[in-house]
């Protein structure tokens, strides 16, 4: 299954990045689940995960660092508490949970470029 | 309003064939998969199997191969399910179910007497 | 393929008093991404099945709260806390966890 997410996004002041990751349709999938992967050389990490089913909106766990929101077949994702050193590629991963037969497909990945602020010169 | 609409229930002979029919409306149809329940009289609900609409492809239940087809219409929004060969034991009432992680709504039935 | 075998085969009770269906599968039904696909349906004569539980323990929108689900694995039981007149019906639970996708016989419930 086709999944696809941008190339490159800048992460803002707040260190908050946001990407659609859209999949290949879902057809009559009424339960899918979306992982946000971080790779880093060969290895993957789970930065985030959510499951939500065509009659009900997208849930991440509430102390996740992610948010988001579904239509159709296109998710927006926003992580947020980012920080220079969490530049990195990463992966939006697909799965079509239910019914059956089970798909799963990842993106190439989001280079997220995260810049910490300047810190405010003191002021006399 | 979501709604399923059946209609095609009739008294036909033995050895014949009926194509029951389930309008849907109120939602995207190719986004849910319909299912086909039977129920004969007097007795329980049994599940025929499930159509993606989206795909097209039919699953059926191991006592609904061969004589039955489950197709679909995507212009019209409409599921079909044709019964061929009929026998006095498809008489039963035919209900249509949209189906996501469970079955919100139902056809209101649709009554296939099979008789000479 | 999966049994799904209801007890008892009809109930009778009185207006107030608790009802409990049982639901046993002959086999897990735990689906492959670790949920469990049991819901329970009432029907009424002449009238289509109404979704009152999915996923064993969630309540459909609208049912009133006293009717409640439970159970795991292979056992599932469908509580009315108290029932009342427009309770009476037939109560089916269904697996939609391994095809060929299953109910079970039915429970009648009778009001005294």
């Known amino acids: 299954m086709h999944v696809a997410q941008p190339a490159v996004v800048l992460a803002s002041s707040r260190g908050v990045a946001s990407f659609v990751c859209e999949y290949g349709s879902s057809g009559n999938a009424a339960e899918v689940r979306v992982t946000v992967l971080r790779q880093a050389g060969s290895q993957m990490t789970e930065v985030c995960a959510a499951t939500y089913t065509v009659e009900d909106e997208l849930a991440f766990l509430d102390d996740s660092t992610c948010t988001g929101t579904s239509s159709g077949n296109k998710v927006n994702l926003t992580i947020q508490g980012l920080r220079a050193m969490d530049t990195g590629l990463y992966i939006c991963k697909v799965e079509l949970m239910y019914p059956p037969p089970y798909y799963v497909g990842m993106g190439n990945g989001t280079q997220i470029y995260v810049i910490d602020p300047e810190p405010c010169p003191d002021s006399d | 309003e979501i709604q399923l609409v059946q209609s095609g229930g009739d008294l036909v002979k033995p050895g014949g064939s009926v194509r029951l029919s389930c309008k849907a409306s109120?939602?995207?149809?190719?986004?849910?998969?319909m299912n086909w329940v039977k129920q004969a009289p007097g007795k329980g609900l049994q599940w025929m199997g499930w159509i993606n609409t989206y795909t097209g492809e039919p699953t059926y239940a191991d006592d609904f191969k061969g004589r039955f087809t489950f197709s679909l219409d995507n212009a019209k929004n409409t599921a079909y399910l044709q019964i061929n060969s009929l026998r006095a034991e498809d008489t039963a009432v035919y209900f249509c179910?949209?189906?996501?992680?469970?079955?919100?709504?139902w056809g209101q039935g649709t009554t296939l007497t099979v008789s000479s | 393929d999966i049994v799904m075998t209801q007890t008892p085969l009809s109930l009778s009770v009185s207006p107030g008093e608790p009802a409990s269906i049982s639901c046993r599968s002959s086999q897990s039904i735990v689906y492959s991404n670790g949920n469990t696909y049991l819901e329970w349906y009432q029907q009424k004569p002449g009238q289509s099945p109404k979704l009152l539980i999915y996923k064993v323990s969630n309540r459909f929108s609208g049912v009133p709260d006293r009717f409640s689900g439970s159970g795991s694995g292979t056992d599932f039981t469908l509580r009315i806390s108290r029932v009342e007149a427009d309770d009476a019906g037939v109560y089916y639970c269904?697996?939609?966890?391994?095809?060929?996708?299953?109910f079970g016989g039915g429970t009648k419930l009778e009001i005294k």
């Open positions: 269904f697996q939609g966890s391994h095809v060929p996708w299953t």
């Open positions: 109120g939602y995207t149809f190719t986004n849910y998969g």
């Open positions: 179910a949209r189906r996501s992680i469970y079955y919100p709504y």
